[in-house]
């Protein structure tokens, strides 16, 4: 169809309403005033515009706000947000958590898109740090959000925000990320009593050092095998058989099923076989009785 510029008589939009879904692209372009659209953005989301029509509406807003949309418009973008490019979003200054929530809602149920990643980046940078409310919001929409951050980015998370983190939020974190998060969690939960503390700290233990694991072993925590298997190998190796037995409690029997997997495999290789035998699990591969164990790392440190 030939491009037309003048709005046909009687078709000028007086308000943004459902009648516009019947307009062809050129009619929308000619008959919808950009300023009217900007003031009635909250209506757009309730109207089943086609993707083609949304393109026209976006174009109108782009012309009205070449330097980037104001937050009053951004908050009501609704499905129009899906039409935005990361370049568009970099022009925005989003400061309201309500605006962030509104836009994340549009993308709910989908993978984190480049648009969403850019939006979050702009929002967090604008705030200066990843505060508790923001983290709460982000992990609610994207449970894997924390684990998508670099250790450097995670360092800006204040300990107070750790209260918002759920176990599933850490499922995809690697040891480098847990190394950063664990000290923050330890600080955040420090005033809790033993059993409550363990429940909260459990999902962060992949970043715990040996001395903290030793301390936990004195508190009858009964760590499950899944948590144990996620511990840092270098933190597990120095633990004695007695400490591991206390740490796992009744779950110690699960070591047999995991004896070929790290960190259990590597830990077994470091234990005396007769110590392992005391567990009565039939664990094999420990240091034979009568052998002398030299700690080469200690020797190197002394020389």
């Amino acid at each position: 169809e030939v491009e037309k510029t003048a709005c046909p008589s009687g078709k000028k939009a007086r308000e943004i309403d459902e009648s516009l879904i019947f307009y062809k692209k050129w009619e929308l372009e000619a008959c919808v005033d950009a300023a009217l659209l900007a003031t009635q953005m909250d209506r757009v989301n309730a109207i089943p515009f086609t993707y083609e029509q949304l393109d026209v509406l976006k174009h109108k807003l782009d012309e009205l706000y070449p330097q980037g949309y104001p937050e009053s418009v951004i908050q009501h973008l609704g499905y129009l947000f899906l039409k935005m490019s990361p370049e568009d979003i970099r022009k925005w200054n989003v400061t309201s958590l309500e605006t962030l929530k509104a836009l994340l809602e549009v993308n709910k149920g989908h993978e984190m898109s480049p648009q969403v990643a850019t939006l979050i980046d702009r929002f967090v940078k604008g705030r200066g740090q990843l505060d508790k409310d923001t983290l709460d919001t982000l992990t609610a929409f994207y449970p894997g959000y924390l684990c998508s951050l670099s250790p450097e980015e995670l360092s800006s998370v204040p300990p107070s925000s750790i209260w918002a983190v759920r176990p599933q939020d850490l499922d995809t974190c690697d040891p480098r990320q847990l190394d950063v998060l664990y000290p923050k969690a330890r600080l955040a939960f420090q005033n809790m009593n033993g059993s409550e503390y363990f429940v909260k700290i459990q999902s962060f233990l992949g970043g715990a050092p040996t001395e903290d694991l030793k301390a936990l072993s004195q508190q009858n925590v009964s760590m499950d095998l899944a948590t144990f298997m996620k511990l840092r190998t270098d933190a597990v190796l120095p633990l004695t058989v007695a400490e591991v037995q206390k740490l796992l409690g009744p779950h110690v029997e699960g070591l047999k099923a995991e004896e070929r997997h790290r960190p259990v495999r590597d830990w077994i290789l470091r234990q005396r076989q007769d110590d392992l035998d005391t567990l009565g699990l039939g664990l094999q591969g420990g240091i034979p009785n009568g052998y002398l164990v030299l700690d080469l790392s200690m020797q190197e440190a002394l020389s």
Epitope: E18, F22, K24, E52
Partner: antibody
């Protein structure tokens, strides 16, 4: 079967209002738009506007803006058309008709299919 | 506002072909529908989307639409086809009717 059943005839004085109902049955009420069309004695069909029963969205012909109000009650699958400030030239048979909105071939915009089911009509007489 | 123009009346002998036209600016760019209305009855859709026939409408009814004119053609016209015929087009969100053509079967 699919049908639209309208309320009975009305006699009104000039300046009064009339409210005509249109009850749908035999199909999903929220799946089709309801249009209102009137026909004065011996005259042409005149379109008044539509309502989307699903959203409640409306669009009225310019001629009736400010005088007509279209509403619906989805719980009883009924659409209503109220015309206020009646004049003698509003004397007519008022019809409701359903029409489906479909996406155009290239999915650029929506358009209406034909009005495939009509009510039996409601005669409104405006006389002093 | 958009207008559709129809001839006031068309006459045809039984068995012959009747053509009723409907003209409007760039009507071919819009979808046209046709309705049949007999005295004292509600209109009935006979053609929609230019040339499609609803179920129950005889094959003798056909339609076309191009340029500025839509045409309803009734081939092998029968006495029962005598009625008023209205063309109708969707102009974006707005509906426009022609003023009807009275088809007389001689």
């Amino acid at each position: 079967q699919v049908q639209l059943v309208q309320s009975g005839a009305e006699v009104k004085k000039p300046g009064a209002s009339v409210k005509v109902s249109c009850k749908a049955s035999g199909y999903t009420f929220t799946g089709y738009y309801i249009h209102w069309v009137r026909q004065a004695p011996g005259q042409c069909l005149e379109w008044m506007g539509w309502i989307n029963p699903k959203s409640g969205g409306t669009h009225y012909a310019q001629k009736f803006q400010g005088r007509v109000t279209m509403t619906r009650d989805t719980s009883i699958s009924t659409a209503y058309m109220e015309l206020s400030r009646l004049r003698s030239d509003d004397t007519a048979v008022y019809y409701c008709a359903r029409a489906e909105a479909r996406l155009a071939a290239r999915q650029e915009y929506y358009y209406f299919y034909g009005m495939d089911v009509w009510g039996q009509g409601t005669t409104v007489t405006v006389s002093s | 506002s958009y207008e559709l123009t129809q001839p006031a009346s068309v006459s045809v002998s039984p068995g012959q072909t009747a053509s009723i036209t409907c003209s409007g600016d760039k009507l071919g760019d819009k979808y046209a529908s046709w309705y049949q209305q007999k005295p004292g009855q509600s209109p009935v859709l006979v053609i929609y989307q230019d040339s499609k026939r609803p179920s129950g409408i005889p094959e003798r009814f056909s339609g076309s639409n191009s340029g500025n004119t839509a045409t309803l053609t009734i081939s092998g016209t029968q006495a029962m086809d005598e009625a008023d015929y209205y063309c109708q087009a969707w102009d974006s969100s707005t509906v426009v009717f022609g003023c009807g053509t009275k088809l007389t079967v001689l």
